[in-house]
Interface confidence: low
């Protein structure tokens, strides 16, 4: 069964800067990745970035740098201040659309005990939805 993992990390140098990493553990080819915060996309979440393997990347503030790390994982840097700034308990979600598995989504947030600059290793997060 395919799985999605999500890792959230706060940067030590900039307390309002977060790095989100997501990966897809499956054999299918990825056609789209959607990163959102505040909940799953389509369920109250707000889209931060959309990554298409061939046609590029679209991102919205406070997302600053979205990129592919591997063919099945992505990373996203967020920088914000004031209302647009993420906070320690913000939930980030990644949805991977793949063929032939369909869509798989998981969410994660900063581990409660995290010091800035530290984070738990990327482990599969609970799968919230499989279309």
């Amino acid at each position: 069964t395919p799985e999605v993992w999500v890792q959230v990390r706060m940067e030590a140098t900039e307390l309002s800067s977060f790095t989100i990493r997501c990966g897809f553990l499956g054999s299918g080819s990825i056609s789209l990745v959607t990163v959102s915060w505040g909940g799953p996309n389509g369920a109250g979440g707000t889209t931060l970035a959309v990554l298409h393997p061939e046609r590029g990347i679209r991102q919205w503030a406070p997302a600053r740098q979205a990129r592919w790390e591997t063919q099945s994982s992505i990373s996203l840097i967020l920088e914000g201040s004031g209302a647009s700034s993420p906070c320690a308990n913000t939930t980030f979600c990644c949805k991977f659309a793949s063929f032939p598995e369909g869509s798989w989504e998981a969410c994660g947030s900063l581990p409660p005990s995290s010091d800035p600059g530290l984070s738990a290793p990327p482990t599969p997060a609970p799968i919230l939805r499989a279309d």
């Epitope: 056609s31 919205w60 503030a61």
Partner: antibody, heavy 119, light 106 residues
């Protein structure tokens, strides 16, 4: 050849809802964003939101959040926009338009659907 | 949200002449601007994207330039069929249209 064909004109009463369709042909429907754009009589163009048929991901202009709902039917390559709680301010021509590239503007447009809200 | 201030709102020009329309963004839009021609009862037509790239089939008398927050669009050798409303669209962060410029050819 890429073509977006929209449903016909609508005359509805205030407070009602309307669903406008946009049928795509000539390309892979699930690979490109469909956007919706509003134009009130004598006014400019206003972006409502987009939907990516490949994953059903949506994004709305804050102004239209809660008023517009974008959906797709992949089996018929059709995008839909539902507008609810209509007022006279919603009387306009609504266009669907396809993104040319992920970071690109709209390259193909539907012919427009005229919505008239009147009692 | 990024705001796009387009000017002028209307202008009149002579056949064979040249016009320039400007759009100013409320922040840097990294050259992600497109220009459209819109005629009454028709669908908007994409002329230029990424500041200066002509869409396929668009004649070279249409041109665009700019960077940062300031962008311009020009039409030279004006023809009668250029009478239309022209819009800029920023697509760097979400999407925002300018207010439009109505062009009349005398």
């Amino acid at each position: 050849q890429v073509h977006l064909h929209q449903s016909g004109p609508e005359l509805v009463k205030p407070g009602a809802s309307v669903k406008i369709s946009c049928k795509a042909s000539g390309y892979t429907f699930t690979a490109y964003y469909i956007n919706w754009v509003k134009q009130r009589p004598g006014q400019g163009l206003e972006w409502i939101g987009w939907i990516f048929p490949g994953s059903d991901s949506t994004y709305y202009n804050e102004k239209f959040k809660g008023r517009a709902t974008l959906t797709v039917d992949k089996s018929s390559s059709t995008a839909y926009m539902l507008l609810n709680s209509l007022t006279s301010e919603d009387s306009a021509v609504y266009f669907c338009a396809r993104d040319g590239e992920l970071r690109g503007p709209f390259d193909y447009w539907g012919q427009g659907t005229t919505l008239t809200v009147s009692s | 949200d990024i705001q796009m201030t387009q000017s002028p709102s209307s202008l009149s020009a002579s056949l064979g002449g040249k016009v320039t329309i400007t759009c100013k963004a409320s922040q840097d839009i990294n050259k992600y601007i497109a220009w459209y021609q819109h005629k009454p009862g028709k669908s908007p037509r994409l002329l230029i994207h990424y500041t200066s790239t002509l869409q396929a089939g668009i004649p070279s008398r249409f041109s665009g330039s700019g960077s940062g927050r300031d962008y311009s669009f020009s039409i030279s050798n004006l023809e009668p069929e250029d009478s239309a409303t022209y819009y800029c669209l920023q697509y760097d962060n979400l999407l925002t249209f300018g207010g439009g410029t109505k062009l009349e050819i005398k």
